[in-house]
């Protein structure tokens, strides 16, 4: 099966990064994090279509058995295939210092 | 936030390791796979309610957008954390072999 | 461990271009939200900032000296350049290159001192 | 740009005080100054940030106040090593500027 970047539901239909604007306050972070006071949150937002970016073989099976049990077995979906690294200024209870964060923001998106 | 193992929707309503029986017709894969016929496919499967089984940041991220713009940002995705390697007896143009396959089964899940 | 080290000339002549390398190592300039800025100190006087880049090549200055600053970096070799055009007596001062996350200064080069002399 | 005004060029204080050091903004920052201690012959090092929070590491003995235009460091228990400059920085909008710097003196 080709696992492929073609959208059958139109374009910007499926599984893609999407750019998010959120405030501390939005996030839930208000009471920890200092800076940024506004994070542009990359996430991967999307359907996946029969084999749209599947990840791997796992995410193949998960198409052909949604296709025949679609009450049981749910389409395979839209997450981050990788992460870009952030830095977060952060309070600590030693004082405010700089965090980096590997699994904050996404980088690419795959269906699985 | 607590990435919590209790499901507040109720007993194996939320994100976890499933097992669906499924033949090689069901896969797709008659032509290609001799053995086994049958495969028992772990998936994962179910809801991924607030901090239940976060993977990462991200996920605690993805829930706290959910919850402020629940039709733009999706809820977290009950997707395998780990997988467990296959082996399948297949067809090759020179004749038949044992391949292994990692990414297969799913061992353990989480949200993301 | 993070280390920022600023080389210079020393010396220069009014007129001439002063070209500042930070190096460093102990983090990345391509994480989000890391940046590097270039400050500088005349002897016995207080702290002024230069300029300013992002792990996203996006550039600040500052508009008193804007026209003659370029700031610029080399993600994959660490390292942060500023170049000061038309160098006078006044430009005489000690400069640092600092790192930031977003707008946190927590570490200081040990700084670079610049004299310019006819 | 914003000003940065800090009108106590020097400041004189015995071992064991209490000191407070300010910094008068142009116009309104919001929380958004920093502190620096600068010793002699060294680079500035961080203490206070968003006007209250103190740098990792940072005793407890250095507290940063005030919101708007007004800000405050105090070093209260003095030490001898706390002989040094201190300048207030904003970083509410481009230029960031900083103060002209408060010399303390150990008596």
């Known amino acids: 099966a080709r696992n492929g970047d073609h959208c059958p539901l139109g374009p910007g239909r499926c599984c893609r990064l999407h750019t998010v604007r959120a405030s501390l306050e939005d996030l839930g972070w208000a009471d920890w994090v200092l800076s940024p006071r506004e994070v542009q949150v990359t996430m991967c937002i999307g359907a996946c279509p029969s084999q749209f970016r599947a990840a791997n073989m796992h995410a193949q099976i998960k198409t052909s058995l949604h296709r025949l049990k679609p009450d049981t077995v749910p389409a395979p979906c839209c997450v981050p295939a990788s992460y870009n690294p952030m830095v977060l200024i952060q309070k600590t209870d030693t004082g405010v210092s700089l965090q980096t964060y590997d699994d904050l923001l996404a980088k690419d998106c795959h269906c699985i | 936030a607590r990435n919590g193992d209790h499901c507040p929707l109720g007993p194996g309503r939320c994100c976890r390791l499933h097992t669906v029986r499924a033949s090689l017709e069901d896969l797709g894969w008659a032509d290609w796979v001799l053995s086994p016929r049958e495969v028992q496919v772990t998936m994962c499967i179910g809801a991924c309610p607030s901090q239940f089984r976060a993977a990462n940041m991200h996920a605690q991220i993805k829930t706290s957008l959910h919850r402020l713009k629940p039709d733009t940002v999706p809820a977290p995705c009950c997707v395998p954390a780990s997988y467990n390697p296959m082996v399948l007896i297949q067809k090759t143009d020179t004749g038949v072999s044992l391949q292994t396959y990692d990414d297969l089964l799913a061992k353990d899940c989480h949200c993301i | 461990q993070v280390t920022l080290k600023e080389s210079g000339p020393g010396i220069l002549q009014p007129s001439q271009t002063l070209s500042l390398t930070c190096s460093f190592s102990?983090?990345?300039?391509?994480?989000?939200?890391?940046?590097v800025s270039w400050i500088r100190q005349p002897s016995g006087k207080g702290l002024e900032w230069l300029a300013h880049i992002y792990w996203d090549d996006d550039k600040r200055y500052n508009p008193s000296l804007k026209s003659r600053l370029t700031i610029s970096k080399d993600t994959s070799s660490n390292q942060v350049f500023l170049e000061i055009t038309s160098v006078d007596t006044a430009d005489t001062a000690t400069y640092y290159c600092?790192?930031?996350?977003?707008?946190?200064?927590?570490?200081w080069g040990q700084g670079t001192t610049l004299t310019v002399s006819s | 740009d914003i000003v940065m005004t800090q009108s106590q060029k020097f400041m004189s204080t015995s071992v064991g005080d209490r000191v407070s050091v300010t910094c008068k903004a142009s116009q309104n920052v919001g929380t958004n100054v920093a502190w620096y201690q600068q010793k002699p012959g060294q680079s500035p090092k961080g203490l206070i940030y968003?006007?209250?929070y103190r740098y990792s590491g940072v005793p407890d003995r250095f507290t940063g106040s005030g919101s708007g235009t007004d800000f405050t460091l105090t070093i209260s228990n003095v030490q001898s090593e706390d002989l040094a400059e201190y300048f207030c920085q904003q970083y509410n909008s481009y230029p960031w500027t900083f103060g002209g710097g408060t010399k303390l003196e150990i008596k």
């Open positions: 102990g983090f990345s300039l391509t994480i989000s939200g890391m940046g």
């Open positions: 600092v790192r930031a996350g977003w707008d946190f200064f927590d570490y």
């Open positions: 968003s006007a209250s």
